[in-house]
C-alpha cells in the first residue's frame, strides 16, 4: 500500500499514532460476559490517544493494522481455585460492532493457569468496537499491573 | 500530542527509535530479587539502541510511550516444582528509580507453568530505570530464546 | 544507526512497513516438526505486506529489527493431555535458513497449559526464513483466533 504524496508531506501523527492502554473498570452484570475498561492519566498509567471508549468498550477511530494486546489475571487464583475452571474460563477479544464485522480475534483459556497474555496484528476499521468477553464464574483482578488491554496502530 | 514543526522536519530517528532487547546475565544475591540483564551483538541477538544498562538494569533515555515485553522461563521446571511453592514464583516489571516514580507495571505468577510472557504499553520518562523482580526460590533459564526482556519506543 | 539523507527524504513506506500475520495451514508429515502457515485477505484476517511465504515458511525481505509474535493453542487439550507427555510439547521459532544463520529465537513449552503466546524483538535480514517447530504428538488448533504467527518491522 503506497502512501499518497499528501500523506508523505503530512506530519507523522496524521499517518496514525493511535494508541490506547486500558485498565479494568468492572465486569458486567451476571449475564453479560464483557469486561468494561477505563483509561486516562487520572486513573494511573492508562491512556487513550485516538481510540475512544463507548460504555467501557474500545472503539477504533482510524483504519489500519493494529497490534492488539491483553493480559487478564484472575482475582483469586491458586491451584485450588484454578480447579474451579469448569469449561475452562476463557477470554476472547473480538470485534462486536458493527454486527456485520463481528469476529473473534484472539481467544485463550486459563486451564491450570491464573493469567493469560497475548497479542496479535489485525486490520481494524474506523468504528470497529472491540469487546473482551470473559466466560465463567471467576473474576478478573482489577490490579493495573495484572489486567490491561491495549491497541497500537502500526501501519495503514 | 501534536508534533512540533521542528520534529516534522527532523529525520525520523530523532522522533525516537529507542529500542532494546536484553538477555539474562545473572540473578542477584539472595536478598536481591532483581534479574540482571545484558545486551550487545557480541553476546548474540541482544542489543541496546538508545536505552542503556546501569548495573544490569535498563534505563530509559527518551520520553515516550513504550511497548515493554518480557519472557522468563524457569531453569528446572515441572508441575511439581512450581506447585510445591506456597507463595507462587512471581515476576514483576516496574520502575524502580527514581523512587518518586516507583511503580509496578507488569506482574505475572508462574503457578502451574514454567514460562511467563507478556507485554504492555506504558509511558516512560528519561531516567526511568526498569527492574524485573523474580520472587521465590526457582532460578530463571539463561537460554537466550527462553528468557529475554525488551522495550520499544512507539510514540511521543 | 543514522538514517541516510536519502532515507530521510523517501516516503515513510520505503523505510520499511513490512508486516505479516499468518494463520495455520497445516502441520508437516510425521518427521517434520514445522508448522505450515498461510496468509491473505481471502483466508480471513491474515495478510503479508512485504514478507513472503516459501512452502509455508515466512521469509523476510527487508533487513531490520522485527517484533516477532506467536500464539499456538493445542487442538484437543486438557490438563491430562498435556501432563501425560514425558517430553513437554514445545514450540520453537527460529531462523532455519540460510543454514549459516540458523538459530532459535523463541522457545516455550506447554507444560500444564494448552496455549503458549509470546513475542520478542530480534534483528532479521533479507532472506532469513523463520520456522516454527512444534515437537510432541499433540496437534495445534487451526482456529484463526487461537493459533497465529506474525512479524512487524520496527526499525532499521
Amino acid at each position: 500500500q503506497r502512501l499518497s504524496r499528501a500523506q508523505q508531506q503530512l506530519p507523522l501523527e496524521s499517518l496514525g499514532w493511535d494508541i490506547a492502554e486500558l485498565q479494568l473498570n468492572h465486569t458486567g452484570p451476571q449475564q453479560d460476559p464483557r469486561l468494561y475498561w477505563q483509561g486516562g492519566p487520572a486513573l494511573g498509567r492508562s491512556f487513550l490517544r485516538g481510540p475512544e471508549l463507548d460504555k467501557g468498550q474500545l472503539r477504533i477511530r482510524r483504519d489500519g493494522i493494529y497490534m492488539v494486546h491483553i493480559q487478564v489475571t484472575l482475582a483469586i487464583c491458586s491451584s485450588t481455585s484454578t480447579s474451579r475452571h469448569h469449561h475452562p474460563t476463557t477470554l476472547a477479544v473480538g470485534i462486536c460492532s458493527p454486527a456485520s464485522r463481528s469476529i473473534s480475534l484472539l481467544r485463550l483459556s486459563f486451564h491450570q493457569g491464573c493469567t493469560i497474555a497475548s497479542q496479535r496484528l489485525t486490520p481494524l476499521a474506523r468504528g470497529d468496537t472491540l469487546c473482551t468477553n470473559l466466560t465463567g464464574t471467576l473474576l478478573p483482578s482489577r490490579n493495573t499491573d495484572e489486567t490491561f488491554f491495549g491497541v497500537q496502530w502500526v501501519r495503514p | 500530542q501534536r508534533l512540533s514543526r521542528a520534529q516534522q522536519q527532523l529525520p525520523l530517528e530523532s522522533l525516537g527509535w529507542d529500542i532494546a532487547e536484553l538477555q539474562l546475565n545473572h540473578t542477584g544475591p539472595q536478598q536481591d530479587p532483581r534479574l540482571y540483564w545484558q545486551g550487545g551483538p557480541a553476546l548474540g541477538r541482544s542489543f541496546l539502541r538508545g536505552p542503556e544498562l546501569d548495573k544490569g538494569q535498563l534505563r530509559i533515555r527518551r520520553d515516550g510511550i513504550y511497548m515493554v515485553h518480557i519472557q522468563v522461563t524457569l531453569a528446572i521446571c515441572s508441575s511439581t516444582s512450581t506447585s510445591r511453592h506456597h507463595h507462587p514464583t512471581t515476576l514483576a516489571v516496574g520502575i524502580c528509580s527514581p523512587a518518586s516514580r516507583s511503580i509496578s507495571l507488569l506482574r505475572l505468577s508462574f503457578h502451574q507453568g514454567c514460562t511467563i510472557a507478556s507485554q504492555r504499553l506504558t509511558p516512560l520518562a528519561r531516567g526511568d530505570t526498569l527492574c524485573t523482580n523474580l520472587t521465590g526460590t526457582l532460578l530463571p533459564s539463561r537460554n537466550t530464546d527462553e528468557t529475554f526482556f525488551g522495550v520499544q519506543w512507539v510514540r511521543p | 544507526q543514522r538514517l541516510s539523507r536519502a532515507q530521510q527524504q523517501l516516503p515513510l513506506e520505503s523505510l520499511g512497513w513490512d508486516i505479516a500475520e499468518l494463520q495455520l495451514n497445516h502441520t508437516g508429515p510425521q518427521q517434520d516438526p514445522r508448522l505450515y502457515w498461510q496468509g491473505g485477505p481471502a483466508l480471513g484476517r491474515s495478510f503479508l505486506r512485504g514478507p513472503e511465504l516459501d512452502k509455508g515458511q515466512l521469509r523476510i525481505r527487508r533487513d531490520g529489527i522485527y517484533m516477532v509474535h506467536i500464539q499456538v493453542t493445542l487442538a484437543i487439550c486438557s490438563s491430562t493431555s498435556t501432563s501425560r507427555h514425558h517430553h513437554p510439547t514445545t514450540l520453537a521459532v527460529g531462523i532455519c535458513s540460510p543454514a549459516s544463520r540458523s538459530i532459535s529465537l523463541l522457545r516455550l513449552s506447554f507444560h500444564q497449559g494448552c496455549t503458549i503466546a509470546s513475542q520478542r524483538l530480534t534483528p532479521l535480514a533479507r532472506g532469513d526464513t523463520l520456522c516454527t517447530n512444534l515437537t510432541g504428538t499433540l496437534l495445534p488448533s487451526r482456529n484463526t483466533d487461537e493459533t497465529f504467527f506474525g512479524v512487524q518491522w520496527v526499525r532499521p
Partner: antibody, heavy 118, light 111 residues
Framework: QVQLVQSGAEVKKPGASVKVSCKAS????????MNWVRQAPGQGLKWMGW????????TYADAFKGRVTMTRDTSISTAYMELSRLRSDDTAVYYC???????????WGQGTTVTVSS | DIVMTQSPDSLAVSLGERATINCRAS??????????MHWYQQKPGQPPKLLIY???NLESGVPDRFSGSGSGTDFTLTISSLQAEDVAVYYC?????????FGQGTKVEIK
C-alpha cells in the same frame, strides 16, 4: 429453572458410611461446581468441600479429609457426597449448593437429614 | 483458616426499623479490587438463600431493602426497613481462600 434435589433422610449407626445424592436440573451441570455444606442441629453452617463437576476433581476442607469423598455422574447430572466412619456428631442436615465461582453459592438443595445413632 | 465472627448473635427490631448485622474476618478477604464476602438468609426449615454477593451486590430477586457494605475485614448487612418475612438467621461467608468459612449466624426477630 435451576433445581437441586437431594436424596431422602438417612439413619446410620456409628462407624457406617452414608452417601447423599444431589440431582441438578435447569442448567448445564458441568458448567458449575457443587459445594457440600453441613448444619448440625441448632448450629451454623460448615463448608465440607466442593467438586469440579467438569473434571471430577474434589477439594476437601481439612476437617473432613480422609472421611469424605465427593463424586459426580455427569450422565445423570448428579453429585454425591459420601461420609465414612460416621460418629454421633455427624448428625446434621447436609446441603448441596451450586458453586457460582467468585459470586457465592447461588442455589441450594433442600437438605438431607443424616442421623447417626446406635 | 479465616475465622468469621458475627455480631450480635441475635437482634430484635421493630417492623419498619433498620437492622444492622456486622461480620468481622480474622484477616482481609479483599484482594484484586473485590471483597470476597457473601451474605445468606436461612428461614426455619429451609436451606440458606444467597442475598448479597461480593460484599455489596444484591442477588437477583432480593428486595432492595437489603444492602451490604464493607471491605477488608469489616462488613455489614443492613435491612433498611424490617418486614415480617425477614425473620431468619443471617450468615456471612468468605470465599477468599480454601476453606470457605461461615460466621456463626445472627438471628433476627421482631420486637
Amino acid at each position: 429453572q435451576v433445581q437441586l434435589v437431594q436424596s431422602g433422610a438417612e439413619v446410620k449407626k456409628p462407624g457406617a458410611s452414608v452417601k447423599v445424592s444431589c440431582k441438578a436440573s435447569g442448567y448445564t451441570f458441568t458448567n458449575y461446581g457443587m459445594n457440600w455444606v453441613r448444619q448440625a442441629p441448632g448450629q451454623g453452617l460448615k463448608w465440607m468441600g466442593w467438586i469440579n463437576t467438569y473434571t471430577g476433581e474434589p477439594t476437601y476442607a481439612d476437617a473432613f479429609k480422609g472421611r469424605v469423598t465427593m463424586t459426580r455422574d455427569t450422565s445423570i447430572s448428579t453429585a454425591y457426597m459420601e461420609l465414612s466412619r460416621l460418629r454421633s456428631d455427624d448428625t446434621a442436615v447436609y446441603y448441596c449448593a451450586r458453586d457460582y465461582g467468585d459470586y457465592g453459592m447461588d442455589y441450594w438443595g433442600q437438605g438431607t437429614t443424616v442421623t447417626v445413632s446406635s | 483458616d479465616i475465622v468469621m465472627t458475627q455480631s450480635p448473635d441475635s437482634l430484635a427490631v421493630s417492623l419498619g426499623e433498620r437492622a444492622t448485622i456486622n461480620c468481622r474476618a480474622s484477616k482481609s478477604v479483599s484482594t484484586s479490587g473485590y471483597s470476597f464476602m457473601h451474605w445468606y438468609q436461612q428461614k426455619p426449615g429451609q436451606p440458606p438463600k444467597l442475598l448479597i454477593y461480593l460484599a455489596s451486590n444484591l442477588e437477583s430477586g432480593v428486595p432492595d431493602r437489603f444492602s451490604g457494605s464493607g471491605s477488608g475485614t469489616d462488613f455489614t448487612l443492613t435491612i433498611s426497613s424490617l418486614q415480617a418475612e425477614d425473620v431468619a438467621v443471617y450468615y456471612c461467608q468468605h470465599s477468599r481462600e480454601v476453606p470457605w468459612t461461615f460466621g456463626q449466624g445472627t438471628k433476627v426477630e421482631i420486637k
